[in-house]
């Protein structure tokens, strides 16, 4: 049978020929009668055999990491007979490992992100090195990890390559770190080989900084003419955090006057001070408000960094604007009796300069020839007034500052002209009527009414009478109806067209004014020839008949 030991050949042997071992048949008595042969991959090129002795040699340098074992076949032949002494047999040559490979980090580049202020022990990343040497051969591939750069902030677990935080880091001081990790084989013993890798560790932001005002004091100005909603200036805080963690909200902490507001421009992160209520320089020209700023998003666990909001004080100076005069009232209503003499007092208006300089005021009345106004605001009549022509005057009073004539204010002035009893009542229309020749006594021939151009505080009341002459002439009589009308009646029977074709009756109408006024009004009565039916046949004036619509035949 075959006799051999297990064959080992160290890798990387530099000698030209290295004896590995001997293949032998136990039938070989050493008289060189057998011939040994080597077959298979590597036979003749990598390995050779001494045909006489069966000694095997490696004639090439071997690399275990390239090939760790060779499977060869051996034959032994009797030289004399040429026949196989033993059956062909397979045998193995193992390439034994030497520490000729350093550890390599295969997953480079390494990059990790970890939140700033993470506590000690927080896992950052695991790095893994690989060693091509034989892990089963001693310590050639047993690795140990260590930190070459990154203390005191990071540490690495020696056997796992797990990188952990060993000291809290503040992104606002440094936002990224390069850590260098070394992997050594031979568990770090002498003669070990090493490899290194760099790990870029970036710190992600957490909201550990509150916003702080750039200035502890701001100065802004606002014109007293500025409308509400006007932006009067900006204030600015800075936050060392980034992104969402730097978003802030401004607000007012103190403003007794409730005159201002602050809104946040979320694009620029500025606070915009706006006017909430109109300001008046003459009332208050200096304001002080305290503003505060807070982050928009603060997780509960980070509230400890945001206990007291940053504040700033804002002084706001109101700028004076020359304002037009201000009337005491929005409009004035005065009363004056008609027929009062020219120069009569009507009323007094008053305007003042609201500004501190208190300019004197000049007054004028627009479009009026009836009234005058002096520099004291006293209004008088410049003509006699007639209520029956104009009962109301709608005017405009203008006040102008003496020191700045461009500063003008106008308000309405209403003057009511009060009535005096200066008009007697008179017929409401022209009355012209007729009486038939055959009219009987007491026949109603006309109802009359009156009007009075005066205004009556109570209802107008008119009194109707015939004049003294007509009272004595008994052809007609009058009855006052007590309702501002009266009826004219015949006071006799029969009239004669030929003798007296027309009567002119004087009627006195008095009003109830104090003093009472009376007018004399003439009623014309035509005598007509009437038929039995009462239809008019002939009157002296055909026009009258026509105008009265009577039939003429």
């Amino acid at each position: 049978g075959w006799v051999w030991n297990q064959f080992f050949v160290p890798e990387e042997m530099n000698t030209t020929s290295h004896h590995i071992g001997q293949l032998r048949s136990d039938l070989d008595n050493g008289n060189n009668s057998f011939q040994y042969k080597l077959l298979g991959a590597g036979a003749g090129s990598t390995f050779i055999i001494d045909e006489r002795t069966g000694d095997i040699y490696a004639i090439q340098k071997l690399d275990r990491e390239e090939r760790s074992l060779y499977i060869l076949r051996a034959q032994v032949i009797d030289i004399a007979t040429g026949r196989a002494v033993e059956p062909e047999s397979e045998f193995v040559i193992k390439v034994s490992d030497i520490n000729d490979n350093e550890p390599k980090f295969l997953d480079e580049p390494y990059e990790a992100i970890v939140p700033e202020m993470s506590p000690e022990g927080t896992l950052v990343i695991q790095v893994t090195a690989s060693d091509a040497d034989d892990p089963s051969s001693g310590n050639n591939a047993r690795l140990l990890y260590s930190l070459l750069q990154g203390q005191p902030y990071f540490s690495v677990e020696p056997t796992t390559g797990v990188i952990r935080i060993s000291s809290k880091m503040d992104r606002e001081l440094q936002d990224e770190y390069w850590v260098i990790i070394q992997a050594k084989d031979m568990i770090g013993q002498p003669g070990a080989l090493s490899g290194t890798t760099s790990v870029l560790i970036k710190l992600s932001d957490v909201n550990d900084n509150k916003p702080i005002f750039k200035e502890s004091l701001y100065r802004l100005t606002v014109s007293e003419s500025a409308p509400t909603g006007t932006s009067i200036g900006t204030i600015m805080a800075y936050d060392n955090d980034i992104g969402e963690n730097a978003e802030m909200d401004y607000s007012i902490e103190e403003d007794d006057s409730q005159t201002f507001d602050i809104i946040t421009n979320h694009e620029t992160q500025e606070g915009i001070v706006i006017l909430k209520k109109k300001v008046d320089f003459e009332h208050q020209n200096h304001y002080g408000i305290r503003a505060k700023v807070k982050n928009h998003h603060v997780p509960e666990q980070l509230m400890k960094y945001h206990t007291e909001a940053s504040t700033t004080f804002i002084k706001i100076q109101v700028e004076d604007v020359d304002e037009p005069p201000l009337f005491l009232l929005p409009y004035y209503v005065f009363e004056v009796f008609e027929e009062t003499p020219q120069g009569s007092f009507v009323g007094v208006v008053s305007a003042t300069d609201p500004d501190n300089r208190k300019s004197p005021i000049r007054y004028s009345i627009t479009r009026s020839k009836v009234f005058n106004i002096n520099d004291n605001g006293t209004i008088t009549t410049s003509n006699s007034l007639d209520r029956e022509i104009s009962a109301w005057y709608n005017l405009s009073i203008t006040a102008t500052e003496k020191y700045n004539i461009e500063q003008i204010s106008s308000i309405p002035l209403y003057v009511q002209v009060l009535n005096i009893n200066d008009h007697a009542p008179e017929f409401s229309q022209y009355y012209e009527t007729y009486v038939c020749e055959n009219a009987g006594s007491g026949q109603v021939i006309q109802t009359i009414s009156a009007v009075d151009r005066d205004e009556s505080i109570e209802e107008h009341h008119f009194y109707f009478n015939l004049s003294v002459e007509d009272t004595n002439n008994s052809s007609f009589t009058i009855i006052d109806n007590q309702d501002n009308t009266a009826v004219i009646l015949t006071n006799r029977t029969g009239f004669n067209l030929q003798e007296e074709p027309v009567f002119y009756i004087s009627i006195l109408i008095a009003d109830n004014g104090i003093p009472s006024l009376t007018s004399t009004n003439t009623l014309t009565i035509h005598v007509c020839d009437c038929g039995d039916s009462g239809s008019t046949q002939t009157c002296q004036y055909q026009e009258l008949v026509l105008s009265m619509g009577f039939k003429t035949e």
Partner: antibody
């Protein structure tokens, strides 16, 4: 600590112009948000504010003195000045310069004052 | 302009006593716009209180201010010998005006 020091003639003739300067030390006159005032005190009487100036040159005066007062600022010298024209004996007073506060318009820092007498 | 009236004109008290000084405005002012000053003879006024209850830097806590609208008060809880001097109130809302002063003297 901000300190203010008034300087100028102690005697001015009637109808002339009173001129005083206030020198600021321990702080910049150009500090944002602060106003620099002149205040006077007639002998044995109360205090009267004259006017103030901001480092930009923007000034505001007491309306009762406005027509006679000019306040100016020189940031390079850290000084501000008062000019009061057409003086009369009624302008005899101790004149103080002052700076307002960081939380309001009150007067936080004062100079020690300088007496100006108007007399012929 | 806003006129400030201080009362009493003179207040006679003994050391250790409580002093109450009044300042009245001719029209309502926001409490944030009133200050108190102390002035010793030959010296410039010194800010005591502003806004109207905040003590200025270095002012002892025996000094306190209060009030709103038109009526304001400076209180000195226990008078010390150095407190016997003149006190002025000042409004700084509408321009700047001072009260005529209250003199605190030793009884």
């Amino acid at each position: 600590q901000v300190q203010l020091q008034e300087s100028g003639p102690g005697l001015v003739k009637p109808s002339q112009t009173l001129s005083l300067t206030c020198t600021v030390s321990g702080g910049s006159i150009s500090s944002s948000g602060y106003y620099w005032s002149w205040i006077r005190q007639h002998p044995g009487k109360g205090l009267e504010w004259i006017g103030y100036i901001y480092y930009t040159g923007s000034a505001y005066y007491n309306p009762s003195l406005k027509s006679r007062v000019t306040i100016s600022v020189d940031t390079s010298k850290n000084q501000f000045s008062l000019k009061l024209s057409s003086v009369t004996a009624a302008d005899t007073a101790v004149y103080y310069c002052a700076r307002d506060g960081s939380s309001g318009w009150y007067f936080q820092y004062w100079g020690q004052g300088t007496l100006v007498t108007v007399s012929s | 302009e806003i006129v400030l009236t201080q009362s009493p004109g003179t207040l006679s008290l003994s050391p250790g006593e409580r002093a109450t000084l009044s300042c009245r405005a001719s029209q309502s002012i926001s409490s944030s716009y009133l200050a108190w000053y102390q002035q010793k003879p030959g010296q410039a006024p010194r800010l005591l209180i502003y806004g109207p209850s905040s003590r200025a830097t270095g002012i002892p806590d025996r000094f306190s201010g209060s009030g709103s609208g038109t009526d304001f008060t400076l209180t000195i809880s226990r008078l010390e010998p150095e407190d016997f001097t003149v006190y002025y109130c000042q409004q700084y809302g509408s321009s700047f005006t001072f009260g005529p002063g209250t003199k605190v003297d030793i009884k």
